[in-house]
């Protein structure tokens, strides 16, 4: 078994009594249907629970829903269904919770056929009160809040109209018809695609991309022949149809669509797709699908403009458009991402990068673990992580990998140890250093969550039988205690804790089944008495992230700087607390060739840090189209990696000259753009 799992760890004294005093049961007065849960605001303790129950009758479906509210992190719930006039709420729209701590909630109601429009219930006081509002349209999508102003909402109607409200859903205005997709950008800007002829589907590849910066008073067409668009970090991407054939290419803008540049990425055909895997203000990870139904493609990483791309990873597993990929941002350590590749023999292997896609490697085999049947050499193998793809294939994997920004270095995931992902029952593994080293944490599949910024890890065994036991660890998964939270086992459906991993409360959701009825039930456990005291300075120890060789002066340098963190000692049983702030001390590193990516017209041969000219461009002037002007590039082949902060050391020369010649970035030329006002 995993270390400490069956062992009396002796770290936490009298925990049964402490937890028993802090375990709160709530039985919901509902027939079992579906249940959805939303947190309203941050550190408010407010939870909304919507239960729905469908009875399919011969002619129609009769539905009933109930709304419950807690303001103490789920310890107690109050039935507030009367606040929404006992109306049936449409679960497919969920509960639209406002950004930040706005306290706003929108619920979309089911209305009878033939009505003029839909109906919503709005709250701006953390669901203490609701206002009923009848809509002049039937919503097709959930209401979308502007990230900058939670009073501004947008929605698409079933008639493909784009509707906007400026007063939190009180009054609505249709600002455009024939809209396929709409998204909020920055500064309350709305981007949307429109069709001219038949429909969104019929006009795919002939759509227009529009922008309004004043909530529909005026518009600008910023792109034509559009297939789709996306926003990532500060980048706006559009996939655009080619003039001559059915291929399309990615164009990118960093000025809200005023000017466009063609991304140096392969074009894709009708059956292929592009996907933004991750993006921040510095760069983007882009997946480009391979031709044919291969189930894989290539990951490219961009420069700081989103234009020049370096090949990052071949044979990247991504099944179909909108399908499954295991690509995971490890949020507990800068620069770390995990994903899966499909190898030549069709087995799936996990890869990890510690430097934002610069290099990928296999995950180190956990110490004291055996290689499984997939391994050719029983002494040499790797850890392979189960993520979205495994879950979609109905393997016995209840959860995707978990990491939290404020639980530095901690990554928890299901996995197997061998040459490839195994279909056998997985175990749970933990890394405390952002994925460099791994340890088996729990035997068999579990649900898991992080509390108190990593001070507590909670797990529940994944079982088809009713359960009544929860496991917890106060030392980053090395030692486990078990607590029986109820005498009567329940059919477990999920673990819920406040997003952000700062809470010390965990809610266990499930249902009880008796001869005639089944009811929803939740148990909320507060761990505050387990972590009796607040952590002090002596409870923390220094940890250098990305350290692989203490003797190397550049040890820990990733993207041009290293970071030392204060980490909680595994032996300290104390509260980080809700106000815990990660303490880190960065220091700048000297530049090396590793801090540069290959510039336009250059590439890196395998296992070489030097960039060499692409043979087909040797001796040619490097001229390319940028923001609608032709540019001449003088370079020795290097461009600093986005977000890299190194100084001194190696300093390759780079100069871009504006040739003062107009050029069109293929299909998105400024000449084709037009504006209009309402």
């Amino acid at each position: 078994s995993a270390p400490g799992e069956d062992e009396e760890c002796g770290r936490v004294r009298d925990f049964v009594a402490k937890l028993a005093n802090n375990t709160h049961q709530h039985v919901f007065d509902d027939l079992r249907g579906s249940v959805s849960l939303s947190w309203v605001g941050d550190s408010t303790g407010v939870i909304l629970v919507l239960t729905t129950f469908h009875v399919p009758l011969v002619i129609m479906t009769f539905g009933q829903s109930k709304l419950y509210r807690s303001e103490d992190y789920g310890k107690n719930f109050k039935d507030i269904t009367d606040l929404i006039n006992n109306t049936f709420i449409r679960t497919e729209f969920g509960m639209a919770i406002g950004p930040e701590n706005s306290g706003k909630v929108v619920l979309t109601a089911e209305v009878s056929g033939g009505s003029r429009g839909g109906r919503i219930f709005r709250s701006s006081d953390f669901a203490k009160n609701f206002v009923q509002t009848d809509l002049p349209f039937h919503p097709l999508t959930q209401m979308m809040y502007s990230p900058q102003n939670s009073d501004y909402l947008l929605a698409l109607s079933t008639e493909n109209g784009l509707w906007v409200s400026k007063n939190f859903g009180g009054k609505w205005e249709e600002i455009h018809k024939a809209v396929c997709l709409a998204k909020w950008g920055s500064d309350n800007t709305i981007f949307f695609t429109t069709y001219a002829n038949g429909s969104c589907k019929a006009d795919l590849g002939a759509l227009e991309l529009w922008r309004t910066s004043d909530l529909g008073k005026s518009f600008k067409t910023i792109g034509v022949k559009i297939y789709s668009f996306g926003l990532g970090g500060r980048f706006l991407f559009a996939s655009v149809m080619a003039d001559k054939d059915t291929t399309r290419r990615i164009h990118v803008s960093t000025d809200q669509g005023d000017t466009w540049s063609m991304a140096q990425l392969p074009s894709v055909g009708q059956e292929q797709f592009y996907s933004i895997l991750a993006a921040n203000d510095d760069m983007v990870f882009m997946h480009v699908d391979e031709p044919g139904d291969t189930g894989f493609g290539t990951i490219f990483t961009s420069d700081d403009r989103g234009i020049v791309y370096s090949k990052s990873l071949d044979r990247h597993l991504y099944t179909t458009t909108g399908g499954e990929t295991d690509f995971t941002n490890v949020t507990s350590l800068r620069g770390v991402y995990i994903t899966s590749v499909l190898s030549e023999d069709n087995s799936i292997q996990t890869m990890i990068t510690f430097d934002q896609g610069g290099r990928w490697t296999h995950l180190r085999k956990p110490e004291n673990s055996e290689c499984d049947a997939t391994a050719k050499n029983k002494n040499e193998c790797s850890l392979h992580i189960h993520a979205s793809y495994s879950i979609s294939q109905k393997l016995n994997v209840p959860m995707a990998p978990l990491s939290e920004p404020n639980a530095v270095g901690i990554v928890i995931a299901h996995g197997s140890v061998g040459d490839a992902i195994s279909v056998m029952v997985p175990d749970v593994y933990i890394s405390d250093d952002g994925g460099y080293s791994w340890t088996k944490m729990l035997e068999g599949p579990h649900y898991y969550t992080i509390l108190d910024s990593g001070g507590i890890i909670v797990a529940i065994e994944h079982s088809s039988r009713p359960i009544n036991v929860i496991k917890f660890s106060t030392d980053e998964g090395q030692c486990w205690q078990t607590y029986t939270f109820t005498r009567d086992p329940i059919y477990f459906t999920g673990l819920a804790s406040e997003p952000g991993a700062r809470s010390m409360n965990i809610s266990i959701w499930g249902f009880t089944e008796s001869f005639l009825t089944s009811q929803w039930v939740s148990y909320t456990i507060d761990f505050k008495d387990i972590l009796e005291r607040n952590c002090e300075e002596k409870d923390y120890t220094i940890w250098l992230a990305h350290s692989t060789d203490p003797e190397d002066y550049e040890d820990g340098c990733i993207l041009g700087y290293k970071e030392q963190f204060l980490r909680l000692r595994k032996s300290s049983v104390c509260q980080n607390g809700r106000d815990y702030v990660v303490t880190k001390q960065p220091s700048i590193c000297l530049c090396s060739l590793e801090d540069f990516l290959c510039d336009f017209g250059y590439y890196r041969p395998e296992n070489d840090s030097k960039c060499v000219e692409q043979p087909e461009l040797k001796g040619h002037d490097l001229e390319f189209c940028l923001y609608g002007r032709e540019e001449h590039l003088t370079t020795n082949g290097y461009r600093k990696i986005p977000g890299d902060k190194c100084q001194g050391g190696v300093n390759p020369v780079r100069e871009v000259k504006d040739l003062k010649k107009k050029c069109t970035s293929n299909f998105l030329s400024p000449e084709k753009q037009n504006s209009k006002s309402n």
């Epitope: 120890t541 350290s547 203490p550």
Partner: antibody, heavy 124, light 107 residues
């Protein structure tokens, strides 16, 4: 090669202070904690504390708090341990020892390089 | 402070014998347990760190096991140069503490 060279033996009177030095060579001095451990004649090992040469931060065993001061001089890769208000039961061999590191952790993995030891005799 | 109890305090063995020394912590120290060898007049030498990892340069006849509170150092085949005193040490909680030592003597 990696080594720690300590200062020579000392004879002190009760109530006096002693300062033992430990010069590191063959490795990056600031990359590892320096521990101090003592061993009384015929007895076992007793940990006194550590100094972080990078920051100068220290951690002392409660038993020596207020009597011990651990410092370092990075320019000459040397760590120091000063023990004041000496008593006869402070007679011991004092060792400096480098803390072993593991993937970014400075503590928890033992002490992999030791000095030759400095004998301190406290006698009136 | 965490107490480290080593047993036996001394043992006599012959060359080629399998020797086992145990160390018990007064509370769980997970795997933060290290083993040292010390010969008379010399500084201690790290043999095993993190309960079971062999320090580089140490012969493979030395091995460590255990987790939580109970730990073991095993010498699979005792060699003449192995006659010494062995100490366990916990490095989980400050203050770091050592066991009382086990003296391995020639039978």
């Amino acid at each position: 090669q990696v080594q720690l060279v300590q200062s020579g033996a000392e004879v002190k009177k009760p109530g006096a202070s002693v300062k033992v030095s430990c010069k590191a060579s063959g490795y990056t001095f600031t990359a590892y904690y320096m521990h101090w451990v003592r061993q009384a004649p015929g007895q076992g090992l007793e940990w006194m504390g550590w100094v972080n040469p990078n920051s100068g931060g220290t951690m002392y065993a409660q038993k020596f708090q207020g009597r011990v001061t651990m410092t370092r001089d990075t320019s000459i890769s040397t760590a120091y341990m000063e023990l004041s208000r000496l008593r006869s039961d402070d007679t011991a061999v004092y060792y400096c020892a480098r803390g072993k590191r593991s993937s970014g952790w400075y503590e928890g993995y033992g002490m992999d390089v030791w000095g030759q030891g400095t004998t301190v005799t406290v006698s009136s | 402070d965490i107490q480290m109890t080593q047993s036996p305090s001394s043992l006599s063995a012959s060359v080629g014998d399998r020797v086992t020394i145990t160390c018990r912590a007064s509370q769980s120290i997970s795997s933060y347990l290290n083993w040292y060898q010390q010969k008379p007049g010399k500084a201690p030498k790290l043999l095993i760190y993190a309960a079971s990892s062999l320090q580089s340069g140490v012969p493979s006849r030395f091995s460590g096991s255990g987790s939580g509170t109970d730990f073991t150092l095993t010498i699979s085949s005792l060699q003449p140069e192995d006659f010494a005193t062995y100490y366990c040490q916990q490095s989980d909680v400050s203050p770091i503490t050592f066991g009382g030592g086990t003296k391995v003597e020639i039978k």
